[in-house]
Interface confidence: low
């Protein structure tokens, strides 16, 4: 097996995995699922939660971007025992307490949520899933679906962002490692390189911004480019062109040498940001050159 | 603090085994996966072999398969190497070094290793 | 023969920037990670998964990864930079470890 594709993405990534009855003798292929899966995103800046649902829906490791954390969050995820009901929107009631505390702390991090089922929804229940996903969707959140075996792809695609946020897996549980590749070209929003990354003090430029995913924001009118200057002040501008793998930018005109611009994009008109580690910085530009 | 200490290393003569051992402390053992490097005098860094958290995958450069195992005691936090008809060749400072990432090595990913032992030689003349 | 391919040595003046390459196949589905190596002392990793900097690491020292090479760039050299530098990565078969031949670099003046 080679590598495969990895994502160098700065957001917030929330599992919401099934764990009801009728995934017992399947919980080894979710959760490799979601281990080969969560190791693909290695940002330093990337934060993870592991949420599961039956009857009720448990945190099952909070929001973190400590790698050891997730590591024993894995642990954890291998060892649990499925069984009861699929309370759905009970694992999105956990992301969306996190979200809201998250924005309540000061932070505009982007989230995105990738929930797994197995099974059609009843009514009730899909009622309940839909509002709740709603409700991560206004404070923020990017929804996937994962559906396999017996799952309603019409319920899953209005959980999700849209039909195209749904992973069906038809094959059953065991098909599971064929959408990892998939699943992280789309769920992926990363922030690669700036071009240039250096400009001149003073002068106006535009900015090449190179990555990934910037077309999977629901409203491409909503991807705003921003610069974090000095580690102080924030300036949003909006971008003349909008690609899947790049963005055209106007650069804030920053006066001096040494000054330092730290990108970040938003996909939702500046509710959340995907941070990067890619830094513009000022020179000093004689005439002429 | 995180550190690997090493011990075992020695003169042997050819066709002899030896055992290197690698003591961890500062973190669990059985969560990372393993590895031993050798460096033969004035030549660059060769990887030797291997071995999941768990001890249940275990992989050899060519070199040596056939000849030295690597195994674990996760229970004393100890990695070794066992070093079986040794050969000229095998002369070296041989390192042990922690995997960073996920402890099964079956895994897509190796991101390097980030935790190196302070290095044993092993001579092997006659 | 290794997988991976560095130059055997490399010369930079003080206070300027010098990149190191490796090349290899596997590279294109793999990490790159690199290390320092002083004379009687083991090596110690200086760029992890291709760009990513243990603390400790200066970050005057970066990396990166495009195609089948990989790169470690140090900008404003200084005298204390003056080692062997190893890539690695796993192999193409995904089963192996492989190191680059190291590369000396000599930092003048």
């Known amino acids: 097996e080679d590598g495969g594709p990895a994502c160098y993405g700065g957001f917030d990534l929330y599992f919401i995995l099934d764990k009801s009855g009728s995934v017992l003798h399947h919980w080894n292929e979710i959760y490799y699922f979601v281990e080969q899966l969560a190791h693909r995103f290695i940002s330093p800046q990337l934060r993870m939660s592991f949420i599961v649902f039956s009857t009720r829906g448990t945190t099952l490791m909070k929001l973190t971007e400590d790698r050891e954390q997730i590591r024993q969050g894995l642990e954890e995820l291998q060892k649990v025992l499925p069984g009861g009901d699929t309370y759905m929107h009970e694992g999105f009631e956990r992301a969306s307490e996190q979200i809201y505390y998250e924005n309540s702390q000061g932070y505009r991090t982007a989230s995105v949520i990738i929930a797994l089922t197995d099974g059609e929804l009843h009514e009730d229940l899909f009622f309940y899933s839909e509002r709740e996903a709603n409700r991560s969707r206004d404070l923020g959140a990017i929804v996937y679906c994962v559906g396999v075996k017996d799952f309603n792809e019409t319920q899953l695609a209005r959980i999700a962002d849209s039909k195209d946020h749904v992973f069906p897996v038809n094959d059953g549980f065991q098909a599971l490692q064929g959408i990892i590749h998939s699943i992280l070209k789309k769920s992926c929003i990363e922030i690669l390189a700036a071009e240039p990354s250096t400009i001149c003090a003073g002068e106006s430029f535009q900015v090449v911004v190179r990555g990934n995913g910037f077309r999977h924001a629901r409203n491409v009118d909503r991807v705003l480019c921003s610069f974090k200057i000095n580690d102080s002040v924030t300036l949003n501008e909006k971008p003349f062109a909008v690609e899947d793998t790049y963005l055209l930018c106007p650069a804030p005109i920053l006066k001096e040498v040494g000054m330092k611009a730290a990108l970040q994009v938003s996909m939702n008109d500046g509710l959340s940001f995907i941070s990067s580690s890619v830094i513009i910085t000022t020179t000093h530009c004689s005439d002429g050159s | 603090q995180v550190q690997l200490v090493q011990s075992g290393g020695g003169v042997v003569q050819p066709g002899r085994p030896l055992r290197l051992s690698c003591a961890a402390s500062g973190f669990n053992l059985g969560s990372y996966a393993m590895s031993w490097v050798r460096q033969a005098p004035g030549k660059g860094l060769e990887w030797v072999s291997a071995i999941s958290g768990s001890g249940g995958s275990t992989y050899y450069a060519d070199s040596v398969k056939g000849r030295f195992t690597i195994s674990r005691d996760n229970s004393k936090n100890t990695l070794y190497l066992q070093m079986n008809s040794l050969r000229a060749e095998d002369t070296a400072v041989y390192y042990c070094?922690?995997?960073?990432?996920?402890?099964?090595?079956?895994?897509?990913?190796?991101?390097?290793?980030?935790?190196w032992g302070q290095g044993t030689t092993v001579t092997v003349s006659s | 023969s290794s997988e991976l391919t560095q130059d055997p040595a490399v010369s930079v003046a003080l206070g300027q920037t010098v990149r190191i390459t490796c090349q290899g196949d596997s590279l294109r589905n793999s990490y790159a990670s690199w290390y320092q190596q002083k004379p009687g002392q083991a090596p110690v990793l200086v760029i992890y998964?291709?760009?990513n900097r243990p603390s400790g690491i200066p970050d005057r020292v970066s990396g990166s990864r495009s195609g089948n090479t990989a790169s470690l760039t140090i900008t404003g050299a200084q005298a204390e930079d003056e080692a062997d530098y190893y890539c690695n990565s796993r192999d193409s078969s995904g089963n192996h470890v492989v190191f680059g031949g190291g590369t000396e670099l000599t930092v003048l003046g």
């Open positions: 070094a922690k995997i960073l990432g996920p402890g099964n090595l079956n895994y897509y990913y190796y991101y390097g290793m980030d935790v």
């Open positions: 998964g291709n760009n």
